[in-house]
Amino acid sequence: MAVTACQGLGFVVSLIGIAGIIAATCMDQWSTQDLYNNPVTAVFNYQGLWRSCVRESSGFTECRGYFTLLGLPAMLQAVRALMIVGIVLGAIGLLVSIFALKCIRIGSMEDSAKANMTLTSGIMFIVSGLCAIAGVSVFANMLVTNFWMSTANMYTGMGGMVQTVQTRYTFGAALFVGWVAGGLTLIGGVMMCIACRGLAPEETNYKAVSYHASGHSVAYKPGGFKASTGFGSNTKNKKIYDGGARTEDEVQSYPSKHDYV
């Protein structure tokens, strides 16, 4: 039950995280005009990964796409790449994790397969989250660098008479959405990996099944004989007969070399 809950929660958290990463990537407010200690203008500038926008006080907003690929800063291209990789990995991870969910039965898929899929999706979520966090952090670092550079040159005198004001940009809402979303995806991935450990039966050299005989004596069937025990390459314990033998499904415990009664 705890495994299912952990897996389900991991899936939901990752789903929210990836939705957030997609939202952040599409948002226009990656950087917004810094209003602090700046002359008050009737125009507000903000920029995203794909376009820059200007909102006039009247409410009129005009956005222009970056219709060049080669003319864009390498850092911006890198951030775009990181966010897209994060989204793609996250989307694949979501697809894989849907089939890996313990509460969903697809044919006769074994727990080992579900465990592997859970682990795969978990790793994908972790990498996806890291990509988003890295992308947002790179952009934030770029902003901080540019902010202090533009602060140093904020007022450049032209003949001592005319002053030109340089627009400074600060953190936009998309950065915070990206950080939170990346964090959630990362947490969801970790939860999936934890759930994977609970799903996978322990693989050992000495596997045994214990069952109660009808008399006082107890029979032991050490693993290693495929024909008699049902063990071998198959990691799922199988009932040999109904005479008191219990499988892992019934007792929720995994056999190991110390499981002798």
Partner: antibody, heavy 118, light 113 residues
Framework: QVQLQESGPGLVKPSETLSLTCTVS????????VHWIRQPPGKGLEWIGV???????NYNSALMSRVTISVDTSKNQFSLKLSSVTAADTAVYYC????????????WGQGTMVTVSS | DIVMTQSPLSLPVTPGEPASISCKSS????????????LTWYLQKPGQSPQLLIY???TGESGVPDRFSGSGSGTDFTLKISRVEAEDVGVYYC?????????FGGGTKVEIK
Amino acid sequence: QVQLQESGPGLVKPSETLSLTCTVSGFSLTTYGVHWIRQPPGKGLEWIGVIWAGGSTNYNSALMSRVTISVDTSKNQFSLKLSSVTAADTAVYYCARAAYYGNGLDYWGQGTMVTVSS
Amino acid sequence: DIVMTQSPLSLPVTPGEPASISCKSSQTLLNSGNQKNYLTWYLQKPGQSPQLLIYWASTGESGVPDRFSGSGSGTDFTLKISRVEAEDVGVYYCQNAYFYPFTFGGGTKVEIK
């Protein structure tokens, strides 16, 4: 069609508060803002302030301590209040609609003359 | 506050001839975000309210004759009338529409010779 009409007392005593109303028609108050401008006799235009569609206001720094611009959407009216008036506040007062593009003023009222005198 | 300086103060013109009015601002009115200059031109005909002619320094308001054109960027702007007509007389004002408070130039009075 778009119309703006200023109204208010033509004569105000010094140190009193000047109150003017701008009644508008032909456009939505939730979409467009309104500016107030004044023009002393024989002089140029002086911007007083603006109230934007969202309700935010901006004022001329020289008048900021004395001016208040507000809106009554139910009456389709904008109002201007200027306290502690002096003879220097004698002017033709205009209200004008804020253009949706370029922060211009695209429609103007015909103006109302206000004289400050005792 | 931004200071808007217009020249000349008075401009006598001959009908059919071109006319040019200059406007300078104490700070750039160019917005880096959209590369637009937030400068507006108005005409106040005798006994009338002002009317909008040009916004964004060079975009003509609808209904305004195309003999009126605006140019310039940053701090230096010009309003040109390709062929002055009798109805063009009045006072022309430029306005800073970028920084608060919005400020008007002193005006240029255009009159027929």
